[in-house]
């Protein structure tokens, strides 16, 4: 009679993570008598997957009943496959021995490849805000996918970006992989409503890529432009001076009026108007009683935006051009400014 051969008909098997893998194995003879064992890998580091004779293998079931006398089918099923299960599996026949069974013949091996989906890409931007014309970096990370081949693209408002660097780790063989990409984006004043998108395509996603997004509103700081103007005289001795704070983002803004360098009033931007591009406008006004001044008045609108160093704009008020009211010592009325907006 011909010597027993162990047949593993499938050179490779591809299974999606979470599914059950079937590893086929048959023997060509019932002799010699002895159990079958399944291993992953070869050499001294090989791992025991199933032992017909003894042991507890909760994820492994046999395809046929191995207790039947004439059984020659030693195929197994491994449930709930993960990327960690990838490798070459060997079906090995042992010959009954005393005191221990002896390895008799091995199958050629079946390579189990596991397809695992990448995790949802996570996009993160810089820790601190940056102003237009500056270049900022965004990172995108996705983990746990297999096989290694993967495509990553970056977009800003639907336009593909080209300035990025991507690494897939580890470089060598692994049960699963991670991708890490860094893209450089130049900010513009119109980017408050902009989005940066990282798109990951993988064989497991059936052409429906995963996307991670970051809103540039979390990253950008658009500094305000200031304009101080003098409005027509309200009453004989009162002048209305307005400070228009335009096109700023985010909203966090504090404004201080100074008269000849002395603080007159401080207020926080509250009722702002929003521009189409997502930036804000605000106006503050100061009613100056010119009759209280003998000399010209230097009015300064000082704005501290989003914790940045203050910027200011000044306006010289010519007192000589106005009649002076005797006995008045009030220089400015601290009238609220948020009731009126020019936009």
């Amino acid at each position: 009679e011909e010597e027993l051969q162990v047949i593993q008909p499938d050179k490779s098997v591809l299974v999606a993570a979470g599914e059950t893998a079937t590893l086929r194995c048959t023997a060509t003879s019932l002799i010699p008598v002895g159990p079958i064992q399944w291993f992953r890998g070869a050499g001294p580091g090989r791992e025991l997957i199933y032992n017909q004779k003894e042991g507890h293998f909760p994820r492994v079931t046999t395809v046929s009943d191995l207790t039947k006398r004439n059984n020659m089918d030693f195929s197994i099923r491994i449930s709930n496959i993960t990327p960690a299960d990838a490798g070459t599996y060997y079906c090995v026949k042992f010959r009954k021995g005393s005191p221990d069974d002896v390895e008799f013949k091995s199958g050629a091996g079946t390579e189990l490849s596991v397809r695992a989906k990448p995790s949802a890409p996570v996009v993160s931007g810089p820790a601190a805000r940056a102003t237009p014309q500056h270049t900022v970096s965004f990172t995108c990370e996705s983990h746990g996918f297999s096989p290694r081949d993967i495509t990553l693209k970056w977009f800003k408002n639907g336009n593909e970006l080209s300035d990025f660097q991507t690494n897939v780790d580890p470089v060598g063989e692994s049960v699963s992989y991670s991708i890490h990409s860094t893209a450089k984006v130049v900010l513009t004043r119109e980017d408050v409503h902009s989005q940066v998108i990282c798109e990951v395509a993988h064989v497991t996603l059936q052409g429906d890529p995963l996307r991670g997004t970051a809103n540039l509103s979390e990253t950008i700081r658009v500094p305000p432009t200031l304009e101080v103007t003098q409005q027509p005289v309200r009453a004989e001795n009162q002048v209305n001076v307005t400070c228009q704070v335009r096109k700023f983002y985010p909203q966090r803004l504090q404004l201080t009026w100074l008269e000849n360098g002395n603080v007159s009033r401080t207020e926080t931007a509250s009722t702002v108007t929003e521009n189409k591009d997502g930036t804000y406008n605000w106006m503050s006004w100061l009613l100056v009683n010119v009759s209280a001044h003998r000399d010209d008045v230097k009015l300064t609108c000082q704005v501290e935006h989003d914790g940045q160093p203050a910027v200011s704009k000044s306006h010289d008020l010519k007192v000589s051009a106005h009649p002076k009211e005797q006995g008045s010592n009030t220089a400015a009325e601290n009238t609220g400014s948020n009731e009126r907006n020019i936009y």
């Epitope: 064992q37 001294p44 580091g45 021995g97 221990d100 002896v102 390895e103």
Partner: antibody
């Protein structure tokens, strides 16, 4: 009780070969991989390779391929290692140890031979 | 190949003292790490297998642990026979590799 008895000290000339032995007793020889480890004078340990007595399957550390050759005689439960083209660098103590026929944590390198000292000198 | 970086290479300590030796793995080896003891006459004995399992007959003052890629052997209450050489060994991936060794000397 499991024991490994290694052959005695060897003094050899450069360019020649030496063959040392490791006789196992106290368990089933064919259920284990036999490993060899080198320790140079005042140095650490280096894994050379291993052999599986059932089918003479061998695995080597790339650094020792062509330098060491592993064999077994199953009938006498003895593992052999031949080190060829000897140089001063081969002067060392060589140990045999074992691991189970698959990767069983408790069975990795439990038992060790006493070592064979090889001195290479002209 | 997986590199096992063992530290310190030598250590002076006193009887009764508690000491820790560390091995850092350059790649993931899971729990597949042994600690070996080598006597001055060359005799090698395994103390710990699978990172933290104590071999039978090994005194309870020896213990093994892991933190990330760092593996430690701790001897609590040194005795005179402990002042020998110690090696870690990874058996996760071939070629199997050893740490450079630690020589434990009496103060």
């Amino acid at each position: 009780e499991v024991q490994f008895q290694q052959s005695g000290t060897v003094l050899a000339r450069p360019g020649t070969s030496v063959k040392m032995s490791c006789k196992a007793s106290g368990s089933t020889f064919t259920s284990y991989w036999m490993h060899w480890v080198k320790q140079g004078p005042g140095q650490g340990l280096q894994w050379i390779g291993a052999i599986y007595p059932v089918n003479n399957d061998t695995t080597y550390n790339q650094k020792f391929k062509g330098k060491a050759e592993l064999t077994v005689v199953t009938s006498t439960s003895t593992a052999y290692m031949e080190v060829s083209s000897l140089t001063n660098e081969d002067s060392a103590v060589y140990y045999c140890t074992r691991s189970f026929y698959y990767s069983l944590d408790a069975a990795w390198f439990v038992y060790w031979g006493q070592g064979t000292l090889v001195t290479v000198s002209a | 190949d997986i590199q096992m970086t063992q530290s310190p290479s030598s250590l002076s300590a006193s009887l009764g003292e508690r000491v820790s030796l560390t091995c850092r793995a350059s790649q993931d080896i899971g729990s597949r790490l042994n600690w070996l003891q080598q006597e001055p006459d060359g005799t090698i004995k395994r103390l710990i297998y699978a990172t933290s399992s104590l071999d039978s007959g090994v005194p309870k003052r020896f213990s093994g642990s892991r933190s990330g890629s760092d593996y430690s052997l701790t001897i609590s209450g040194l005795e005179s026979e402990d002042f020998v050489d110690y090696y870690c060994l990874q058996y996760a991936s071939s070629p199997f590799t050893f740490g450079g060794g630690t020589k434990l000397e009496i103060n």
